[in-house]
């Protein structure tokens, strides 16, 4: 559950459960910075633009990232 304004790190909770790629509007990977010392993965869902924070350490999330990047590379010319 992310915040709607940026204060240090963005996420309130992180999930180990992957989201359904078909329900996904976009997936952002925010690298660690001076504002937040950890990588944050924010999934924006198609329905209501709801944002969900995913645990970058979770195996299931790593698999989701691989699947999404594979799908993107298929689409790119």
């Amino acid at each position: 559950v992310p915040l709607s304004r940026t204060v240090r790190c963005t996420c309130i909770s992180i999930s180990n459960q992957p989201v359904n790629p078909r329900s996904l509007e976009k997936l952002e990977i925010i690298p660690a910075s001076q504002f937040c010392p950890r990588v944050e993965i924010i999934a924006t869902m198609k329905k209501k633009g709801e944002k969900r924070c995913l645990n970058p350490e979770s195996k299931a999330i790593k698999n989701l990232l691989k699947a999404v990047s594979k799908e993107r590379s298929k689409r790119s010319p």
Epitope: V1, P2, L3, S4, R5, V7, R8, C9, C11, I12, S13, I14, S15, N16, Q17, V19, C36, R38, K48, E50, R52, N55
Partner: antibody
Amino acid sequence: QVQLVESGGGVVQPGRSLRLSCAASGFTFSNSGIHWVRQAPGKGLEWVAVISYDGSNKFYADSVKGRFTISRDNSKNTLYLQMNSLRAEDTAVYYCAKLRDNGEYLDYWGQGTLVTVSS
Amino acid sequence: NFMLTQPHSVSESPGKTVTISCTGSGGSIDRNYVQWYQQRPGSSPTTVIYEDNQRPSGVPDRFSGSIDSSSNSASLTISGLKTEDEADYYCQSYVETPEWVFGGGTKLTVL
């Protein structure tokens, strides 16, 4: 199974302090944002504060801002609410409640602890 | 400030259907999800509806939720009322996560 157990409530005089604890078990505490919600006797639910999974973000209701501090110790699976400058209107049952990891609702609540502010 | 307003009380007979409304003011109720919590006397709240119309596992399908953008309101409908449904019901949403807003609560009496 998921358990949230609040403690630390009691009777306290106006202007004094109290610290509530919420011991968590049965889930990955270090992944979960946790809220404090209170309920004055015979009244409705009032959101008090929330802390992010890693403690880096904290938000408070206007009614407690500057007086209450939410914190957590992930090594002990425990949430805290430090309440200073207590007022009669802070009298309530205080619940800790966890956010569902992949959604925006409170899927588990503690049994609550009663705080009575009275002279 | 975003606020949620509920009727103070509603009552209905066993077996009938009851609808509890939750009207938003100071913001659009369909911008974010609405949750409904049930609180039986002397107990902690539990979720009966989340994300507008989703039921947690274990909640019977007699409970349903909906959103009406035109009236800026959410509704909780309970069909086939049972005496065990007698409780206080609270809607909850937010304008800015994670600063939450609860409705004032509705006392449901099953006559």
